[in-house]
């Protein structure tokens, strides 16, 4: 857990909710070098394991909108454009942090939440289970 | 910007820093159904665009450890195990939220930060630029 601070110059934490509750400055600092990176660009179309992006919207969460990748095929796309079912398109998932409004309707009170999102797809060799 | 709330039952926001500052409960709620999902499992090894995971650690950030994917090859791995340089292994990137301690070393004061992380790799057809 997060320990109780005694640092001078830090915001007061003598709150009954501390150490569970912290102050967060919402002036987001963006560490991305490009101001608007085309992150995964058009990879979703050019990949051998292409995917579609589906919008997941929830106004009680920040970010309110998250895009979920759904692989287009069970198999992977070959150079001739056909699908090779000897290979598998699988989603690459990542656990991300979001802020959930809590109590609901309170615009300045949140709870940290972890959610699992599919970011894109990759083509893998299947695991073959041999029957004895 | 974010406006000053007057909702009863909501945390007080008559702070000189408000509306930039909100309260966040750090008792993380985990929405993932599985308690410990093997997120992208062993896909990093089985993928035709395999990757290695590099640890990015920063004690002034939450989460303090983030795993960054680095594609192993410029090309993609063929069925015979050789690398096909007519295809490209590329990182799938995602913008994620982290909490940055601010002022530094203050355990209960954070700033929201967006960082771009590589989650895994996918195999794409290269964009060929034809010279006239």
């Amino acid at each position: 857990g997060i320990a109780i601070p005694r640092n001078s110059g830090c915001p007061n934490s003598e709150d009954k909710n501390f150490p569970r509750t912290v102050m967060v400055n919402l002036n987001i600092h963006n560490r991305n070098t490009s101001t608007n990176p085309k992150r995964s660009s058009d990879y979703y179309n050019r990949s051998t394991s292409p995917w579609n992006l589906h919008r997941n919207e929830d106004p009680e969460r920040y970010p309110s909108v998250i895009w979920e990748a759904k692989c287009r095929h069970l198999g992977c796309v070959k150079a001739d454009g056909n699908v090779d079912y000897h290979m598998n398109s699988v989603p690459i998932q990542q656990e991300i942090l979001v802020l959930r409004r809590e109590p609901r309707h309170c615009p300045n009170s949140f709870r940290l939440e972890k959610i699992l999102v599919s970011v894109g797809c990759t083509c893998v060799t299947p695991i073959v289970h041999h029957v004895a | 910007g974010i406006a000053i709330p007057r909702n009863s039952g909501c945390p007080n926001s008559e702070d000189k820093n408000f509306p930039r500052t909100v309260m966040v409960n750090l008792n993380i709620h985990n929405r993932n159904t599985s308690t410990n999902p093997k997120r992208s499992s062993d896909y990093y090894n089985r993928s035709t665009s395999p990757w290695n995971l590099h640890r990015n650690e920063d004690p002034e950030r939450y989460p303090s450890v983030i795993w960054e994917a680095k594609c192993r090859h410029l090309g993609c791995v063929k069925a015979d195990g050789n690398v096909d340089y007519h295809m490209n292994s590329v990182p799938i990137q995602q913008e994620i939220l982290v909490l940055r301690r601010e002022p530094r070393h203050c355990p209960n004061s954070f700033r929201l930060e967006k960082i771009l992380v590589s989650v895994g790799c996918t195999c794409v057809t290269p964009i060929v630029h034809h010279v006239a």
Epitope: N36, S64, W67, H105 | I2
Partner: antibody, heavy 122, light 110 residues
Amino acid sequence: EVQLVESGGGLVKPEGSLRLSCAASGFSFSSDYWMCWVRQAPGKGLEWIACIYAGDVDDTDYASWARGRFTISRDNSKNTVYLQMNSLRAEDTAVYYCARVDGFDITYFDLWGQGTLVTVSS
Amino acid sequence: DIQMTQSPSSLSASVGDRVTITCQASQTINYWLAWYQQKPGKPPKLLIYRASTLASGVPSRFSGSGSGTDFTLTISSLQPEDFATYYCQNYYYSTSRSYGFGGGTKLTVL
């Protein structure tokens, strides 16, 4: 100063086309915002037209009546959002406002331009 | 689409009066409702969001309440600068997002 400035309005004949522009300054188009168009006919109320995500995913929403005739687009390098209007009718005469939705709270419009007047008349 | 019915459509009052404007949604919108003030020749100005949260810089004489389908904007003591047209606005998401506005309430001097 954070502001939105619309341009491109004017007189157009019925069945004609027009492209409106909205230049943003004081902030950059990014994953933090959605850019929208809202219109107001003379002496009438406000009517939402469409919104577009300002981040790196191409995503749009349209009012049911606007889909097909109106197209929202953006150019992040120019920090500008556009509204292409086709097959214009007299009832499309209105002040067209550019408005921003902050991704922190997508339930309302937090910034508005001054508007540009479009008149559809023969 | 969700219909937003605002009433009254026009209202006359005097400085110092307490004024109430209502907005009714055709289906539940939780508390995702905003109120705007608009003066002639100007764009709308945000007053209230999330049904009851006062926007930055807005005087405390303005307040909002309600949830579900019924919402109210109250001006506790009218000031000369408050004579304007007021609009409610909803947010809704099902398969796609939509915003809708009420027809407006024109507040004039009695």
